[in-house]
């Protein structure tokens, strides 16, 4: 985050830029930017192997939740969206691409079908989905 | 928008950030930006007049949809919330808060109450609605 | 505390149809699946199929697909299981099981009293 | 549909032995895979889930293992109220398919 006042006294400008005001950055292009994580909601019906491979064309993940707090942005989302959660058969755990463990109390987690993936909906909820399935998805991306 | 070379040659730093990522702003803090608008989704219920309020508190007003492409995330919103879009009854007219005319074919009007205001809700719809209702609201702030 | 309750003992007629309920209680009915398992009369357990509950959505194990409708209603948080075309070997205690998918929560982990619905003419 | 052969059928043991009761799958089904136990006149009790998960509430004298396709139940030390019927379930694909039961009797 370029803080306003760093930016003013370096550029000279008589723009006022309250201090409160920041940047949020840097993203792709075109890209939702939000407490510094770049987020983007992609249209078109792709199956979860397909989603991945198109987030990560693009120097991101699958979404990623993290953060109640730091992403309550995703409160309002409408629809399902493949999320970056799979299933690890081999040890029963549910797990982001980065191979961290989903914590506890993050997301309702619903049983909507048999899969190894899930989709992201609304008000941090989870539906579990064959990872076949086509459905849009939400690519990620963290700031450094 | 800081475009990433300029910033890399200005501060002479190492760090490489693609030519297609974008600083957006400046937005006030914790809010989203988008194609360099800022917006802030509010979890508490005030009538139309409070909201507005509550956004000039803010230097910003309430959401004004004025470009299918450039605000296509309104595209996903879950739920009812007040825009600054009201019924100007001396001419029939829906405006803007800023007094300009409402474009055609930018939102699907729907009558669910007798009101003088709007609410948005996903896929570009207004929902006409007394503008007493207590509402969650969306607050708008343009960049320069 | 979590509870599946059942509805009482049916005696049908072959041809006839029979509907059991299952009645959920102390936990948020949408979340978990909801599986529907027979015994026969000193036989072993059998899988018939299970229901979304979030999505209406059924799953039927083959061997009942056509003649079973699984249904749930989440404004009273019960579960329906409908069989038609009931023959002689239909006669079994019904069991209603919590889970659907056993991806993320525990198989039928809990599970209704049963309810016996013997086919005789 | 998988085949789930649950062996031995019966079983005769005495209060204090370790007992073992094997499923074997007639494909792969990763972990997915349950151990119930069944008394008279009541509804199965889910035991062990994923294959070697301890159910919250269930007495740590009970665990499970894979080996492939062979599962395996195993009781370290028979309490009387372990005397009951137990069944193996494959949750991996459609139909999903228990085995035949196996019954623990007193010796």
């Known amino acids: 985050i370029w803080s306003a006042v760093f930016l003013n006294s370096l550029f000279n400008q008589e723009v006022q830029i309250p201090l409160t005001e920041s940047y949020c950055g840097p993203c792709p292009k075109n890209w939702i930017c939000y407490k510094n994580n770049c987020y983007q909601f992609f249209d078109e019906s792709k199956n979860w192997y397909e989603s991945q491979a198109s987030c990560m064309s693009q120097n991101a993940s699958l979404l990623k939740v993290y953060s109640k707090e730091d992403q309550d942005l995703l409160k309002l989302v409408k629809s399902y969206h493949w999320m970056g959660l799979v299933h690890i058969p081999t040890n029963g755990s549910w797990q982001w691409e980065d191979g961290s463990i989903l914590s506890p109390n993050l997301l309702t987690i619903i049983e909507m079908q048999k899969g190894d993936c899930a989709l992201y909906a609304s008000s941090f909820k989870g539906y579990i989905e064959n990872c076949s399935t086509p459905n849009t998805y939400i690519c990620m991306q963290r700031t450094v | 928008i800081w475009s990433a070379v300029f910033l890399n040659s200005l501060f002479n730093q190492e760090v490489q950030i693609p030519l297609t990522e974008s600083y957006c702003g400046p937005c006030p803090k914790n809010w989203i930006c988008y194609k360099n608008n800022c917006y802030q989704f509010f979890d508490e219920s005030k009538n139309w007049y409070e909201s507005q309020a509550s956004c000039m508190s803010q230097n910003a007003s309430l959401l004004k949809v004025y470009s299918k492409e450039d605000q296509d995330l309104l595209k996903l919103v879950k739920s009812y919330h007040w825009m600054g879009l009201v019924h100007i009854p001396t001419n029939g007219s829906w405006q803007w808060e800023d007094g300009s005319i409402l474009s055609p074919n930018l939102l699907t009007i729907i009558e669910m109450q007798k009101g003088d205001c709007a609410l948005y809700a996903s896929s570009f719809k207004g929902y006409i609605e007394n503008c007493s209702t207590p509402n969650t609201y969306i607050c708008m702030q343009r960049t320069v | 505390q979590v509870q599946l309750q059942q509805s009482g003992t049916e005696v049908k007629k072959p041809g006839a149809s029979v509907k059991v309920s299952c009645k959920a209680s102390?936990?948020?009915?949408?979340?978990?699946?909801l599986t529907w398992i027979r015994q026969a009369p000193g036989q072993g357990l059998e899988w018939m199929g299970w229901?979304?509950?979030?999505?209406?959505?059924?799953n039927y194990s083959l061997k009942f697909q056509g003649r079973v409708t699984m249904t749930a209603d989440t404004f009273t948080n019960t579960a329906y299981m409908e069989l038609r075309s009931l023959r002689s070997d239909d006669t079994a205690v019904y069991y209603c099981?919590?889970?659907?998918?056993?991806?993320?929560?525990?198989?039928?982990?809990?599970w209704g009293q049963g309810t016996l619905v013997t086919v005789s003419s | 549909a998988i085949r789930m052969t649950q062996s031995p059928s019966s079983l005769s043991a005495s209060v204090g032995d370790r007992v073992t009761i094997t499923c074997r799958a007639s494909?792969?089904?990763?972990?997915?895979l349950g151990w119930y136990q069944q008394k008279p006149g009541k509804a199965p009790k889910l035991l062990i889930f994923?294959?070697?998960n301890l159910e919250s509430g269930v007495p740590s004298r009970f665990s499970g293992s894979r080996f492939g396709t062979d599962f395996t139940l195993t009781i370290s030390s028979l309490q009387p109220e372990d005397f009951a019927t137990y069944y193996c379930?494959?949750?991996?694909?459609?139909?999903?398919?228990f085995g035949q039961g196996t019954k623990l009797e007193i010796k």
């Open positions: 099981a919590r889970g659907g998918t056993g991806d993320y929560y525990p198989l039928f982990d809990y």
């Open positions: 102390g936990y948020t009915f949408t979340t978990y699946g």
């Open positions: 229901i979304s509950v979030f999505n209406g959505s059924p």
């Open positions: 494909q792969g089904i990763r972990n997915d």
């Open positions: 994923a294959a070697s």
């Open positions: 379930l494959q949750d991996y694909n459609y139909p999903y398919t």
